[in-house]
């Protein structure tokens, strides 16, 4: 959930040692306690629709709701992109889209969530039961990926709801190290705000630009009706790959993203999205990885934004998709 | 360093297939991707189309599907194309350019070019 | 597909000049635009990626700018050498595709 919290502008301390430590003490408090707020779980979204026109034509949907910068998402299919997973598509906000047959058409929906048109007939067609998955890496939440499919009974046209996608699994580096940092900023903010407790309260001046009080604004999808789930039956008769579920399967290395540039890229501004809001889903495999970004910030300046690829030594098997994605 | 080295030039009869090979080094195919372009003489550019190593899933413009196949040996880092069903409009220098990932998202290095000449 | 226009076919300068060639994209390819050099009998050498990042070992004379839809390659102090073709190309999207090139010529 995003989550932003509007801090006052402080009055300046008095001068001198203690006027110094006033400031330290107040200021602190308040950058924490904007961690916390602001510490939420991003979520991925997945979202499988039939076409009505063409049974073998599908649209995928995907969205990341969290606050931070996305860098690259990477559709796959036939499970998660580290579990024999297939790369259909390779979005990145600056530097271009890639898809690969049977993906027709990929595009940015919004500054987050991104469309995926597939079509074929034969091998390389998709069918009813088969599983996409989105992986969204961002800074600085990290990777998170989530997977949907059309449910066992449902007409073309009509579409699975989006997924949200909860942690499943996660990597202990982020879980552990982001969670540990905001757990100990939590604990020491209210360390800080009992040893205040008894003293006068600090003089607040409100920020020039938002005159009103301190306030946390929440933002959460709506939980829309949820009666898109039951559809009528439609029989389906393509042939197409197994879905390869496979949540017990780590990646088999880094991921070939691990250093992703530190700028914010201005990410594209698409058209509104489309109507429906992300809203829970039964039977949909989910699955979720949070990577933390360990090289982030080294390359030199004068190399321009870049992404450092990890080939796999393993051969074709191992670098399954294009770009190296497992 | 990166280096590309295509095949010699070809001579080919209307009708004929031609198959052009670039050569990569300083790098392994399965790390970038290989595209392909053509320039007619005096002409612009004309991309052809990408194949992904990694994937072996091939994009083609739309101008050259059924014209040209595009395929990878990953053993010995060669990348082909092939080109069927030949006719004069045909005739042309065909570059192999690396498809860079990492940084530029484009074609960065480039091979020299293949002459094709297709008469009668 | 996007189409990339360069509207100056040629465009003649003199040795120390400043010279501009712009491309305009038919819709928005954010910063995904390249820049290639083609002298007379060679293969294109790459010379900006990503609009405004020079590629290794190009002289700090050649600029790229630009972003969503108007690009533009600045090459200032001009010398002879640069007598070449000039391409953009767009690879926001698949089918990439090049401008229609413009050959600067030296005075």
């Known amino acids: 959930m995003r989550t932003e919290a509007q801090v006052p502008a402080l009055q300046p301390p008095e001068p001198g040692l203690e006027g110094a430590m006033g400031h330290r003490t107040l200021v602190l408090p308040w950058v924490l306690l904007t961690l916390c707020v602001t510490a939420g779980t991003p979520e991925v979204w997945v979202q499988v629709r039939m076409e009505a026109t063409e049974l073998s034509s599908f649209t995928i949907r995907c969205g990341f709701l969290g606050s931070g910068s996305i860098s690259l998402v990477t559709v796959s299919w036939g499970g998660p992109n580290g579990a024999g997973g297939t790369t259909l598509a390779v979005l990145h906000p600056e530097r271009g889209i890639r898809q690969w047959a049977p993906a027709r058409q990929a595009r940015w929906e919004t500054q987050s969530s991104i469309s995926l048109i597939l079509e074929g007939s034969g091998a390389s067609s998709p069918c009813a039961n088969t599983t996409f998955c989105c992986k969204f890496a961002s800074f600085p939440e990290g990777s998170w990926e989530a997977c949907g499919s059309l449910p066992p009974s449902s007409d073309p046209g009509l579409s699975a709801p989006p997924t949200p996608a909860p942690i499943l699994r996660a990597d202990l580096a982020g879980i552990l190290g982001v969670s540990g940092v905001l757990l100990f900023g939590c604990v020491y903010l209210l360390h800080l705000l009992r040893r205040h407790k008894h003293r006068p309260a600090p003089r607040l001046q409100p920020s020039r630009t938002s005159p009103q009080a301190p306030r946390a604004r929440a933002w959460a999808p709506s939980q829309a009706s949820q009666a898109a789930l039951h559809v009528p039956y439609a029989t389906i008769n393509t042939s197409c790959r197994p879905a390869t579920l496979d949540t017990a399967h780590p990646h088999g290395g880094p991921s070939w993203w691990a250093s992703l540039p530190t700028h914010a890229a201005h990410r594209p501004q698409g058209p509104a999205a489309w109507a429906s809001t992300p809203i829970p889903a039964r039977g949909s495999f989910v699955s979720v990885e949070n990577g933390l970004y360990a090289q982030a910030g080294e390359r030199p300046p004068h190399t321009g934004p870049g992404l450092t690829l990890f080939p796999d030594p393993r051969g074709p098997r191992a670098m399954e998709g294009p770009l190296g994605v497992r | 360093q990166v280096q590309l080295q295509q095949s010699g030039p070809e001579l080919a009869r209307p009708g004929a297939s031609v198959k052009l090979s670039c050569k990569a080094s300083?790098?392994?195919?399965?790390?970038?991707?290989i595209s392909w372009v053509k320039q007619r003489t005096g002409q612009g550019l004309e991309w052809i189309g990408e194949?992904?190593?990694?994937?072996?899933?091939?994009y083609y413009s739309e101008k050259f599907k059924g014209k040209a196949t595009l395929t990878a040996d990953k053993s010995s880092n060669i990348a082909y194309m092939q080109l069927s069903s030949l006719t004069s409009e045909d005739s042309a220098v065909y570059f192999c350019?690396?498809?860079?990932?990492?940084?530029?998202?484009?074609?960065?290095?480039w091979g020299q070019g293949t002459s094709v000449t297709v008469s009668s | 597909d996007i189409v990339m226009t360069q509207s100056q076919k040629c465009m003649s300068t003199s040795v120390g000049d400043r010279v501009s060639i712009t491309c305009k994209a038919s819709?928005?390819?954010?910063?995904?635009v390249a820049w290639y050099q083609q002298k007379p009998g060679q293969s294109p050498k790459t010379l900006i990626y990503?609009?405004?990042n020079r590629h290794t070992g190009v002289p700090d004379r050649f600029t790229g700018s630009g972003s969503g839809t108007d690009f533009t390659l600045t090459i200032t102090n001009v010398q002879s050498e640069d007598l070449a073709d000039y391409f953009c190309?767009?690879?926001?999207?698949?089918?990439?595709?090049f401008g229609g090139g413009t050959e600067l010529e030296i005075k």
């Open positions: 350019a690396r498809s860079d990932y990492s940084d530029y998202w484009a074609m960065d290095y």
């Open positions: 300083g790098y392994t195919l399965t790390s970038h991707g």
């Open positions: 194949i992904y190593p990694g994937s072996e899933s091939p």
């Open positions: 819709q928005n390819v954010r910063s995904a």
């Open positions: 990503l609009a405004s």
């Open positions: 190309l767009q690879h926001w999207n698949y089918p990439w595709t």
